[in-house]
């Protein structure tokens, strides 16, 4: 239904707290360099204006669209051109072009310092002094670093943060209470960020149809007892929610997500038997819980997929009558039978099925042609299964750090032109798949591994798009989203690459490395490893292991030495010489 004032409508639906949080996220995601105080001022002005519209929907400007209102606010910021360069040109445009322009200027890799967590005491003090400001800072800092973070989900993580601080700041040992809990939230939020970015990429590059197909597969796996009409309704609603969030319409997105959660809880009987626990929770927790609810039990009496999609004489007729509906039912039926497959794999199978029908239905004897389609799925299924087995075996053998290093070597060989920081970040993230997925039961490994890898590789593609340097990466990133991971896996050593010349300073270290936290130490070592591979792309695993073991020994020795500086300055050059010899 149309509302006289959109801003009043959203304020009423969401309530002041969520309204303010979402406006802050929106501004922080659009203008990523502004300080918290600048954004907080704008948020307060927008909120005060929304309240005047609630009081009188006919008041001046209350009938304007949210894009117009928010865009006007952003464009009124002083020194916009000095701070944001060509983004200021967006302000010369009219809506909806202005908003599109803002979206295009979102930076997936802003040059902001890492979000450092303050020391426990200081955190608790500022939290107690002003919890609202404290949480505002959290929303601002996360949103500006992750301009596509799913806004209603970020409110959920802020709520989690709040609960942890409330609990731990009352403890005697605040540090040991806060650290593991906040680390857990951070890890989940980072995964949520790359997953959502993948959804927005799908929407931006391939449109709503592609996202809806993803949603149908995912929902069919989770709710195998829901009928196709129900799954289609949920997928359509979920597509709308994600389209809004990816498009910067955060108030509409959060409002529609709350509506979807409400609908699901009111229709549990036709959706799933597993929703009740989620539905008993308050809004943010409820929506979060529903998004990762366990799969319902599969119906026992499902007929073989071949009956309707291979053996039926009507296949081509049904396909001709409504291509998208027929392919949608195929995806639904296949997905509900395979919670053990990744969504990417299911979409590849649906694509193969579509290509088979396109070819076979044009033949004189279609059934003879498409009769073998299910057998043709086999290699497509085996490939990711082998990937999971090989990688999980390697992870179990090497542990997370060693596994990350193996991936780093592999990916540096595939795309040595990519910057070392990007390769290290990618390898560290890809390597976490072991800890995240390889410990799961067998039937959950494949969906966990492949869908996580796809999301991480999407980030690799986004970073590479900014400064394309590798033809290998460009090739894999320009295809369809579901083909990316197999494409990257199939890449081998880039034979066109001219090895980097050996620079001693790249492998020269100082005593300051000794005081770094373990994570930072690992990054330094992994940076050196990537540089070694760039110098010798065809070095064997044994050669690289010898060098890295020597390097680790050197760090251990010098960091334990009484005179660290002298140790580093005398032993360092020896290490460099040994490295060159080992790789000769």
């Amino acid at each position: 239904e149309a509302h006289k004032s959109e801003i009043a409508h959203r304020y009423n639906d969401l309530g002041e707290q969520h309204f303010k949080g979402l406006v802050l996220i929106a501004f922080s995601q659009y203008l990523q360099k502004c300080s918290y105080d600048e954004h907080a001022k704008l948020v307060q002005e927008v909120t005060d204006f929304a309240k005047t519209c609630v009081a009188d929907e006919s008041a001046a400007n209350c009938d304007k669209s949210l894009h117009t209102l928010f865009g006007d606010k952003l464009c009124a910021i002083p020194n916009l051109r000095e701070n944001y360069g060509e983004l200021a040109d967006c302000c010369t445009k009219q809506e909806p072009e202005r908003n599109e322009c803002f979206l295009q200027h979102k930076d997936d890799n802003p040059s902001l310092p890492p979000f450092e967590r303050p020391e426990a005491e200081a955190m608790c003090t500022s939290f107690k002094e002003n919890p609202t400001t404290f949480m505002g800072h959290y929303l601002h800092e996360v949103a500006r670093r992750h301009p596509y973070f799913y806004a209603p989900e970020l409110l959920y993580y802020a709520e989690q943060y709040n609960e942890i601080l409330t609990q731990c700041c009352a403890e005697a040992d605040k540090e040991s209470c806060l650290t593991p809990k906040l680390d857990g939230v951070k890890e989940k939020a980072l995964v949520s960020s790359v997953r959502q970015r993948m959804k927005c990429s799908s929407m931006q590059k391939f449109g709503e149809r592609a996202f809806k197909a993803w949603a149908v597969a995912r929902l069919s796996q989770t709710f195998p007892n829901a009928d196709f009409a129900e799954i289609t309704k949920l997928a359509t609603d979920l597509t709308k929610v994600n389209k809004e969030c990816c498009h910067g319409d955060l108030l509409e997105c959060a409002d529609d997500r709350a509506e979807l959660a409400k609908y699901m809880c009111e229709n549990q009987a036709t959706i799933s038997s597993k929703l009740q626990t989620c539905c008993d929770k308050p809004l943010l927790k409820k929506a979060h819980c529903l998004s990762e609810v366990e799969h319902d039990t599969m119906p026992a009496d499902l007929p073989a997929i071949a009956a309707d999609f291979v053996e039926d004489q009507e296949v081509c007729k049904n396909y001709a009558e409504a291509k998208d509906v027929f392919l949608g039912t195929f995806l639904y039926e296949y997905s509900r039978r395979h919670p053990d497959y990744s969504v990417s794999l299911l979409l590849r199978l649906a694509k193969k099925y579509e290509a088979t029908l396109e070819k076979c239905c044009a033949e004189a004897n279609p059934p003879a042609c498409y009769g073998t389609v299910l057998a043709e799925f086999q290699p497509l299924v085996e490939e990711p299964k082998n990937l999971v087995k090989t990688n999980c075996d390697l992870y179990e053998k090497l542990g997370e750090y060693g596994f990350q290093n193996a991936i780093l070597v592999r990916y540096t060989q595939k795309a040595p032109q990519v910057s070392t920081p990007t390769l290290v970040e990618a390898a560290r993230n890809l390597g976490r798949v072991g800890t995240k997925c390889c410990t799961l039961p067998e039937d959950q490994r494949l969906p966990c591994v492949e869908d996580y890898l796809s999301a991480i590789l999407n980030r690799v593609c986004l970073l590479h798009e900014k400064t394309p340097v590798s033809e290998h990466v460009t090739k894999c990133c320009s295809g369809s989203l579901v083909e990316r991971r197999p494409c990257f896996s199939a890449l081998t050593v880039d034979e066109t690459y001219v090895p980097k010349e050996f620079k001693a300073e790249t492998f020269t270290f100082h005593s300051d490395i000794c005081t770094l936290p373990e994570k930072e130490k690992q990054i330094k070592k992994q940076t050196a490893l990537a540089e070694l591979v760039k110098h010798k792309p065809k070095a064997t695993a044994e050669q690289l292991k010898t060098v890295m073991d020597d390097f680790a020994q050197f760090l251990d020795t010098c960091c334990k030495a009484a005179d660290k500086d002298t140790c580093f300055s005398t032993e360092g050059p020896n290490l460099v010489t040994r490295c060159k010899d080992a790789l000769a």
Epitope: Q313, E314, V315, K317, A320, E321, C361, A362, A364, N365
Partner: nanobody, 115 residues
Framework: KVQLVESGGGLVQPGGSLRLSCAAS????????MSWVRQAPGKGPEWVSS????????LYADSVKGRFTISRDNSKNTLYLQMNSLRAEDTAVYYC????????SSQGTLVTVSS
């Protein structure tokens, strides 16, 4: 909505000829193989002939081979069946179908071969 409308049937003497047409709409005609299927009174459906989307490949049931010719005009979205040397056993309702379907989803056209 997919629609198939057959025409051209009628009463013909044994040894005579008829040309059946099937006007198709609601789908990309040239992307689909098409078939003619017939059903004699009190019998089940019987496949007669098929043609690929481009018209380059054709298949015939042994009972009509050498007598019937299937063709199509993709510019007119029309399928044809030229029937020569008709026999009494060719009497049936003839339907055009998409792909390899034997199930009629249209009215069909009646062909009666009788002296």
């Amino acid at each position: 909505k997919v629609q198939l409308v057959e025409s051209g049937g009628g009463l013909v003497q044994p040894g005579g000829s008829l040309r059946l047409s099937c006007a198709a709409s609601g789908f990309t005609f040239s992307s689909f193989g098409m078939s003619w299927v017939r059903q004699a009174p009190g019998k089940g459906p019987e496949w007669v002939s098929s043609i690929s989307g481009s018209g380059s490949d054709t298949l015939y049931a042994d009972s009509v081979k050498g007598r019937f010719t299937i063709s199509r005009d993709n510019s007119k979205n029309t399928l044809y069946l030229q029937m020569n040397s008709l026999r009494a056993e060719d009497t049936a309702v003839y339907y055009c179908t998409i792909g390899g379907s034997l199930r009629a989803s249209s009215q069909g056209t009646l062909v009666t071969v009788s002296s």
